[in-house]
């Protein structure tokens, strides 16, 4: 009995850029003589139904498809037809199939790759055209993929030591496509400075399906009112 | 930076069992697979086996079939070697080794190395 | 299982001088195009470290006075310029095959 058995739940994530291995194990009632099997890998895009071959191995041959792309004879010899593709690119992602070859048996699995790219984020103070007491705080995630992405802005006061979420003069843009296919996203907070309290603190706070844990950017409101030169004004912030 | 740290020296009897410990750090533990190699006093380099870290997958040498035990616990990224049934011949120094598996098959990167000495 | 024959079992070279190790397989190493043959040097009191792998691909972070090559079953490795950090226990390897299997040793050291 010939068996293939890949990812759990059907779906493998990785980050933009990363050398990805694909998972594909083989089952088989007898040890593996990979001189006389064949490995075959098959990538179908997320836009296109077109099935296009990725890779092959066959018993004292191996031909890459796509550059970088390998199967390695050493695992193969322990049941482990895993992919392995360097570099991987957003436009990537999509099905994978494994089909395993041990005359006159056959067996084939699939995947769903899933490439994610995760933001940068940065706190800009701008003060240009704000009324006096005023203040605009930007924050910028960028290099993000896929495009949903949830900003959030929280402050903790000396009184309130828990973070509550602000939800009134927070104004988020629309994201941005970049040349590359990941996207830009500002957030914006509204501060009248001089209705709160010094010393509180304030924090961007960015979820995204590349993180495991949210992105936080935060600066403290101090007494003397920020007071940026031209320069400054689209500096880092935190 | 890449390190391999292997358990302190052992002492066993004839028909005793030894095992040994390689903790990986530096390198995503299941991208190379972890292999053992083994040096007698004053002897050469001669391979035991290998384990993918992957899937658990084993390749023994047929010399130590039956007597050694190759595994892992991903979760602490660590390898494990187990001799059973030892015989004075198997006082060695035993070393995990990182092997590369994609880009041609060598190690790169060794444990400090693991005495066991089998003595009645 | 494939035998790895090493020629000379030992050698004493000036500083400054080249060397040359052999190392002979019983069979070809040699898969869809490339040499399974790598290089190791253990210094006394020391694990073995990779030196060459693919018969002829420099290890990172080795002095390129190290050299090998070959294909099938006839490799050398080749010392430029021997120097006195270079002592040690050189061994040959083939990875094409299981049992993987290393060559005895030639033990290089310095006049």
């Known amino acids: 009995d010939l068996k293939v058995e890949m990812m759990a739940g059907g779906t493998q994530i990785t980050p933009l850029n990363d050398n990805v291995t694909i998972f594909c194990n083989i089952f088989y009632s007898q040890p593996l003589n990979i001189t006389s099997m064949g490995i075959t890998w098959f990538w179908k895009s997320l836009t296109f139904d077109k099935e296009v071959k990725v890779f092959e191995f066959f018993g004292d041959h191996q031909e890459a498809f796509r550059p970088g792309a390998i199967v390695s004879p050493w695992r193969l010899k322990s049941g482990d037809a895993s992919l392995r593709l360097p570099g991987i690119q957003l436009e990537e992602a999509g099905e994978y199939r494994c089909e395993v070859v041990v005359t006159p048996l056959k067996a084939q699995g699939t995947v769903q790759l899933e490439v994610v790219a995760s933001p940068a984020s940065r706190l800009l103070l701008d003060q240009v055209g704000m009324k006096e007491n005023e203040d605009k705080y930007m924050c910028e995630s960028s290099g993000f993929y896929p495009e949903a992405i949830n900003i959030t802005w929280e402050k903790q006061t000396q009184k309130f030591p828990h973070p509550i979420e602000i939800s009134e003069d927070v104004i988020t843009g629309p994201t941005i496509k970049n040349m590359d296919g990941t996207f830009n996203v500002t957030s914006c907070l509204k501060l009248n400075s001089s209705q709160e309290d010094p010393g509180t603190v304030y924090q961007c706070v960015v979820r995204h399906a590349s993180l495991h844990t949210p992105l936080r950017s935060n600066f403290t409101l101090t007494a003397a009112r920020h007071s940026l030169s031209e320069t400054e004004k689209t500096d880092n912030f935190s | 930076e890449v390190q391999l740290v292997q358990s302190g020296a052992e002492v066993k009897k004839p028909g005793a069992s030894v095992k040994v410990s390689c903790k990986a750090s530096?390198?995503?533990?299941?991208?190379?697979?972890m292999d053992w190699v083994r040096q007698a006093p004053g002897k050469g380099l001669e391979w035991i086996g290998d384990i993918n870290p992957n899937n658990g997958g084993t390749l023994y040498n047929q010399k130590f079939r039956g007597r050694v035990t190759l595994t892992v616990d991903k979760s602490i990224s660590t390898a494990y070697m187990e001799l059973s049934r030892l015989r004075s011949d198997d006082t060695a120094v035993y070393y995990c080794?990182?092997?590369?598996?994609?880009?041609?098959?060598?190690?790169?990167?060794w444990g400090q190395g693991t005495t066991v000495t089998v003595s009645s | 299982d494939i035998v790895l024959t090493q020629t000379p079992l030992s050698l004493s070279v000036t500083p400054g001088q080249p060397a040359s190790i052999s190392c002979k397989a019983s069979?070809?190493?040699?898969?869809?195009?490339?040499?399974?043959m790598n290089w190791y040097l253990q210094k006394p009191g020391q694990p073995p470290q990779l030196l060459i792998y693919?018969?002829?691909t420099l290890h990172s972070g080795i002095p390129d006075r190290f050299s090998g090559s070959g294909s099938g079953t006839d490799f050398t490795l080749k010392i430029s310029r021997v120097e006195a950090e270079d002592v040690g226990v050189y061994y040959c390897q083939q990875s094409k095959e299981d049992p993987r299997t290393f060559g005895q040793g030639t033990k290089l050291e310095i006049k």
């Open positions: 693919a018969a002829s």
């Open positions: 530096g390198y995503t533990f299941t991208d190379y697979n």
């Open positions: 080794a990182r092997s590369e598996v994609f880009y041609g098959n060598y190690a790169d990167y």
């Open positions: 069979q070809s190493v040699d898969y869809d195009g490339d040499s399974y």
